[in-house]
């Protein structure tokens, strides 16, 4: 089995985590990516994805989460904005490729989060102060919140994030042979 | 329709073990992870942990570790919970429950439960 | 591990009425992507329990609508708009931010 290989990233409360995970590959151009969190014994969990297919340069927020895929470069661009401690934790970025499972794309980030100094907020370099000027026309949950064979009523979730669910990505068919969980041995 | 169907009623002695049996159908069984859920009678539910069917990666709650063991098997679409080293105060129904996939973590469907008594 | 608190314990309803139960988590449930990792079930007498409300605030399919859930964060409710009589089981909240997942100890709910 492939020896899986973690970043370490060691921030405070309040900071941005700006990750950037290159594909390189161009047949991975426009395939829909995600950025999932890793529970304990390799459950990873969905929290956001780009479109599918995937827009060039074209970020979009989900809660505290931003994305942009930068297919020139060949890279997804992650950042998580104004981190709590609850945020830390291990994170990978994939590429869903149906009806193959997604491929990860290395390293994976491991995300210490800890207290901040009790200075001004957002005085430092690494801060979010500007991170919400990207327009609010990005902000979707473009990850369907919950793939069933039944219909599922959605509602955004009650936070200040304003995060809708296009009703395009509610009721998908065959979903779990599209976005089947990543395994890692 | 989605389903999952668990194996019958066991009584086991103290300090035997017990292996439960949980067969999905009605969806592709790889593709959504499987928790096990208890519930001593006339108590509130109590996780136990979870398995990923498609790998067999588990996580366990402490309270089990070392003895409690999920496995599947995925030519028969089936998950199985085994306890060691029972005592009485695992005497519990004990049910199998599959995890939406994707963005939420919730458990959409639960199987009909197994009585697990344990007695001298 | 998160600690869950549910109240109240029991409650005693009339049909036709509101109903309205309290569960708060020892941490924050919302997670970075703006959803809140609380879910709500209901186990009805000598049935294995059914989700009803999942990430806070989203009824589950074929949930009837007088049932909703709201909050952020670490506090939440879940409100029968007009409780019916197959409404009586035990609720449980059960927070999936992160393993082990857990639940609140539950509030029983009957026809007074």
């Known amino acids: 089995a492939t020896k899986l290989t973690e970043e370490k990233y060691e921030l405070k409360e309040g900071q941005t985590l700006d990750v950037k995970c290159d594909y390189t590959l161009e047949k991975f151009a426009s395939s829909q990516k995600a950025w999932q969190i890793i529970r304990d014994g390799e459950m990873p969990k969905t929290l956001a994805c780009t479109e599918r297919p995937s827009k060039n340069s074209h970020p979009v927020q989900v809660g505290r989460i931003i994305l942009e895929d930068y297919h020139d470069h060949g890279l997804l661009r992650v950042r998580m904005v104004n981190l709590q401690v609850e945020d830390s934790g291990l994170y990978q970025c994939v590429i869903y490729q149906p009806p193959k499972e997604p491929h990860m794309l290395f390293d994976r980030i491991r995300l210490v989060v800890t207290k901040g100094f009790s200075g001004t907020p957002g005085s430092n370099e690494n801060s979010t102060q500007n991170v919400y000027k990207i327009p609010p026309t990005t902000t979707k949950a473009l990850c369907p919140l919950y793939t069933s064979p039944r219909t599922v009523t959605q509602a955004p979730p009650k936070s200040t994030a304003d995060v809708s669910t296009p009703d395009s990505e509610i009721n998908l068919t065959n979903v779990t042979d599209i976005i089947r969980v990543p395994v890692f041995n | 329709q989605v389903q999952l169907v668990q194996s019958g009623a066991e009584v086991k002695k103290p300090g035997a073990s017990v292996k439960v049996s949980c067969k999905a159908s009605?969806?592709?069984?790889?593709?959504?992870?499987m928790h096990w859920v208890r519930q001593a009678p006339g108590q509130g539910l109590e996780w136990m942990g979870i398995?990923?069917?498609?790998?067999?990666?588990?996580s366990y709650a402490q309270k089990f570790q070392g003895r409690v063991t999920m496995t599947r098997d995925t030519s028969t679409s089936t998950v199985y919970m085994e306890l060691s080293s029972l005592r009485s105060e695992d005497t519990a129904v004990y049910y199998c429950a599959r995890e939406v996939s994707m963005t939420a973590a919730s458990l959409d469907v639960w199987g009909q439960g197994t009585m697990v008594t344990v007695s001298s | 591990d998160i600690v869950m608190t549910q109240s109240p314990l029991s409650l005693p309803v009339t049909p036709g009425e509101p109903a309205s139960i309290s569960c708060r988590s020892s941490?924050?449930?919302?997670?970075?992507?703006?959803?809140?990792?609380l879910d709500w079930y209901l186990q009805k007498p000598g049935q294995s329990p059914q989700l009803l409300i999942y990430l806070g605030s989203n009824r589950a399919s074929g949930v009837p609508d007088r049932f909703s859930g709201s909050g952020s964060g670490t506090d939440f409710t879940l409100k029968i708009s007009r409780v019916e009589a197959e409404d009586v089981g035990v609720y449980y909240c059960m927070q999936a931010r992160q393993t082990p997942f857990t639940f609140g100890g539950g509030t029983k709910v009957e026809i007074k």
């Open positions: 398995i990923n069917p498609s790998g067999g990666s588990t």
């Open positions: 941490q924050s449930l919302l997670h970075s992507n703006g959803y809140n990792y």
């Open positions: 009605g969806y592709t069984f790889t593709s959504y992870y």
